[in-house]
C-alpha cells in the first residue's frame, strides 16, 4: 500500500545467499554473489559486448533530479543472443545495466517465455556502486540443463513505472531424440490391419524413425517424425518398437506387444455358494480372456438323474460379477452345472461340470380332494384327503397340519392338529354344536409346511339331528361349500 503510483508494490528479484564476505565501502563491488554450489558452469558468456548500448527497449523515465537535469536513456547492454548446449551441461548467462543513482528503488527480475522466474535459486545479482551510477549485473545459471530449460530468457527492470526489457537470450538444449508419442500395446483381430504411431523431437532436428518388429527393422528407409506404421495383419503375437535418430544419436522406444485376439479359455473353479430347494447360487473364476474383454456367460444346467430326459437348461448372464443364482429348480434334485463365457471372437469351451443338489423344501401344493363329514354317533368330524403329487411334495412327507375353525353366534375358535404321514384321514372331536366348522389341510416335510387347502365348511347341528352327506373340497371357482340342513 503505497502513495506514489510510480512506486509499485512489486517484488524485486531474489538474491540468494550465502554470500562470501561482507559488504565493503561504497566504491567496491557489492553483493558479488557466486553460484551457491561453487560449481563452475561449462559455458559462460561475457555479460556485455563493449560499445553499443542496447536500443531495443529504452526507457527515458519521466523524472528529473532536484536540479532538473534531464536523464539519459536507460537500456540493458547487448549480450549473447543464442546459446546452444547439450543436455546436462551447465550454463551461465547474464544481462547488465548501468543505473544512475537517481533511481533508488529499481527492481530487476528474470523472465522465461513470458513468465516471471519467481524464487529462482540460480539467479544472482552483483552491484557496483559509484558516485553517479550503479552497475548491475544479473546472472542466471543452470547447473544441469534439461529440455524444459529451452526457451527465451529476458531481464526486466522496473523504474518509476517504466519497464526496461533486455534482448532475449535463447537457450537451446540439444540432446538425443525425446519421444512425445510411443507405440502402444494392442490386441488385434487375426489378419486385420492396424496402425502404430511413433513421434520424437529434438533439438536437434530432424528426427528420423525406423520401425522394428521382433528385433528386425521393418523399413529400410527412415521416415521423418512423426511416423505411422500400417501393419497389414498378424497371425501371431509380435513385438514392435521404434528407433528415433538425430545428429546426437539414437533413442529406442519401449517394445510393445501386439496380441492376437482368440476365443477365451473355459472358466475354472465353478463352485456352489448356496443351495435352496429351488435355486443354486454358483460362482466361477473366468479363464484367460483371449485378449478381448468378456461379453457374457452362459450357465448350462442338466438334471443328473439317469431317468431324466437329459434336456439342458441354459441361463445367460453378464460376465461380471462371476456369480449367478440358478432359479426354478426342483427341490431335492441333483444337477450337473457348467459355465461358458464369450468375447468378441466367440464362446469358450464349457468349464468342467460340477454336481449340485437342491435342498428339501416345503410342499408346493396342498393335499387334494379334502372331504369332511359329521359322525353324529361318535360326536366326531371325519376328514379325508389325497396326498399331493410326489413331484410337488418337494421332499419327504412327515405329516399333515389340520386347521379347524369353529364359528357360532359371533364366537370364533381355531384349533391346529398335527397328523403323522401315514394314511390320509383324520378324526377330530366336535367342539361346538349349532356351529360351522371350517377345515383346511397342509402337507408337511422337513423343509417346512406347504400351502393350506381351500377351506371346507360343515354345519354341526344341535344334538339329535340326523347324519347327512359330507362336505368336500369344491371344484375351482365355486363358493365355499356349506352343508345346509
Amino acid at each position: 500500500a503505497i502513495t506514489e503510483a510510480r512506486e509499485e508494490a512489486k517484488p524485486y528479484p531474489l538474491f540468494p545467499g550465502p554470500f562470501p564476505g561482507s559488504l565493503q565501502t561504497d566504491h567496491t563491488p557489492l553483493l558479488s554473489l557466486p553460484h551457491a554450489s561453487g560449481y563452475q558452469p561449462a559455458l559462460m558468456f561475457s555479460p556485455t559486448q563493449p560499445g553499443r548500448p542496447h536500443t531495443g527497449n529504452v526507457a527515458i523515465p519521466q523524472v528529473t533530479s532536484v536540479e532538473s537535469k534531464p536523464l539519459p536513456p536507460l537500456a540493458f547492454k547487448h549480450t549473447v543472443g543464442h546459446i546452444i548446449l547439450s543436455e546436462h551441461k551447465g550454463v551461465k548467462f547474464n544481462c547488465s545495466i548501468s543505473v544512475p543513482n537517481i533511481y533508488q528503488d529499481t527492481t530487476i527480475s528474470w523472465w522465461k517465455d513470458g513468465k516471471e522466474l519467481l524464487g529462482a535459486h540460480h539467479a544472482i545479482t552483483q552491484f557496483y556502486p559509484d558516485d553517479e551510477v550503479t552497475a548491475i549485473i544479473a546472472s542466471f545459471s543452470i547447473t544441469s540443463v534439461q529440455r524444459s530449460d529451452n526457451g527465451s530468457y529476458i531481464c526486466k527492470m522496473k523504474i518509476n513505472n517504466e519497464e526496461i526489457v533486455s534482448d532475449p537470450i535463447y537457450i537451446e538444449v540439444q540432446g538425443l531424440p525425446h519421444f512425445t508419442k510411443q507405440p502402444e500395446s494392442m490386441n488385434v483381430t487375426r489378419n486385420t490391419a492396424f496402425n502404430l504411431t511413433c513421434q520424437a523431437v529434438g533439438p536437434p532436428e530432424p528426427v528420423n524413425i525406423f520401425w522394428v518388429q521382433n528385433s528386425s527393422r521393418v523399413n529400410e528407409q527412415p521416415e521423418k517424425s512423426p511416423s505411422v506404421l500400417t501393419v497389414p495383419g498378424l497371425t501371431e503375437m509380435a513385438v514392435f518398437s521404434c528407433e528415433a535418430h538425430n545428429d546426437k544419436g539414437l533413442t529406442v522406444s519401449k517394445g510393445v506387444q501386439i496380441n492376437i485376439k482368440a476365443i477365451p479359455s473355459p472358466p475354472t473353479e465353478v463352485s456352489i455358494r448356496n443351495s435352496t430347494a429351488h435355486s443354486i447360487l454358483i460362482s466361477w473364476v473366468p479363464g484367460f480372456d483371449g485378449y478381448s474383454p468378456f461379453r457374457n456367460c452362459s450357465i448350462q444346467v442338466k438334471e443328473a438323474d439317469p431317468l431324466s430326459n437329459g434336456s439342458v437348461m441354459i441361463f445367460n448372464t453378464s460376465a461380471l460379477p462371476h456369480l449367478y443364482q440358478i432359479k426354478q429348480l426342483q427341490a431335492l434334485a441333483n444337477y450337473s452345472i457348467g459355465v461358458s463365457c464369450m468375447n468378441e471372437i466367440g464362446w469358450s469351451a464349457v468349464s468342467p461340470w460340477i454336481l449340485a443338489s437342491t435342498t428339501e423344501g416345503a410342499p408346493s401344493v396342498a393335499p387334494l380332494n379334502v372331504t369332511v363329514f359329521l359322525n353324529e354317533s361318535s360326536d366326531n368330524v371325519d376328514i379325508r384327503w389325497m396326498k399331493p403329487p410326489t413331484k410337488q411334495q418337494d421332499g419327504e412327507l412327515v405329516g399333515y397340519r389340520i386347521s379347524h375353525v369353529w364359528q357360532s353366534a359371533g364366537i370364533s375358535k381355531e384349533l391346529l392338529e398335527e397328523v403323522g404321514q401315514n394314511g390320509s384321514r383324520a378324526r377330530i372331536s366336535v367342539q361346538v354344536h349349532n356351529a360351522t366348522c371350517t377345515v383346511r389341510i397342509a402337507a408337511v416335510t422337513r423343509g417346512g409346511v406347504g400351502p393350506f387347502s381351500d377351506p371346507v365348511k360343515i354345519f354341526i347341528p344341535a344334538h339329535g339331528w340326523v347324519d347327512y352327506a359330507p362336505s368336500s373340497t369344491p371344484a375351482p371357482g365355486n363358493a365355499d361349500p356349506v352343508l345346509i340342513i
Epitope: 506514489e4 517484488p11 544512475p100 543513482n101 533508488q104 530487476i108
Partner: antibody, heavy 120, light 107 residues
Framework: LIQLVQSGPELKKPGETVKISCKAS????????MNWVKQDPGKGLKWMGW????????TYADDFKGRFVFSMETSASAAFLQINNLKNEDTATYFC?????????????WGQGTTLTVSS | DIVMTQSPKFMSTSVGDRVSITCKAS??????VAWYKKKPGQSPKALIN???NRHTGVPDRFTGSGSGTDFTLTISNVQSEDLADYFC?????????FGGGTKLEIK
Amino acid sequence: LIQLVQSGPELKKPGETVKISCKASGYTFTNHGMNWVKQDPGKGLKWMGWINTYTGEPTYADDFKGRFVFSMETSASAAFLQINNLKNEDTATYFCARKGVTAARYFDYWGQGTTLTVSS
Amino acid sequence: DIVMTQSPKFMSTSVGDRVSITCKASQNVRTAVAWYKKKPGQSPKALINLASNRHTGVPDRFTGSGSGTDFTLTISNVQSEDLADYFCLQHWNYPLTFGGGTKLEIK
C-alpha cells in the same frame, strides 16, 4: 565511517508541528534513499515510507499519509520528517534508516532515534 | 500487507550457548529478509540482509538462513554483548514490515 545523526528529543502539545532532522555523513547522500521508521512506546517498528534523496520524491505508507512530510536538503546531507497537527498517538521514537544498494529495499545504517512526546 | 510473525518474544540464554530466532512471513518473500540488533539507547545495527548475507563487520557467530516464508537467525557461542532486542524486516514488497522483536537475556 557512515553515520546518521538525528536531532534531540522533542516535547510538544497536541495541534503543534515538529520537524525531526537526520544528518548523514561518510557517504554520498544522494546515492541512497532515506527511510523513516516509527516505534511506539513498548511496541514494535512500523515503516513510514521513504524519500528519494536524488529527486526529493517522497513515498508514504498508507498510515502516514496527510500530516507527515518527508523532505531533504542536499547541501546539508540531511533528511527531515515533519509532523503537522500533532496528536497524542504520535508519541514515539522516530528513526531514519538508509536504503542499502540501489535495487534492494533493506536498511544498512540507522540513526539513533528521536523521541517525540506529545502531551497537553 | 505481509505480516512477519517473530518468535520467541523473550529468550534467556547463557554465554557460550547457541540460540535461534525465527520469523514467519504470511506470504512468499523469496530471500528478502534482513535481521537487526538493537541495544537500549542505541540505533539498530544491521546484521543480515537478503536472508543470509552478513553485513560489514558482523561476527560470523551470526548466521541467517531460510527462504520463502520461514527464516532463522542463529547466534552460536552467545557472548554477553549479544544481550539486545533482535528483529526481522521483510524487504520484498512495499509496505516493508517488521517482526515483533525478540528480547535476548543473558543468565
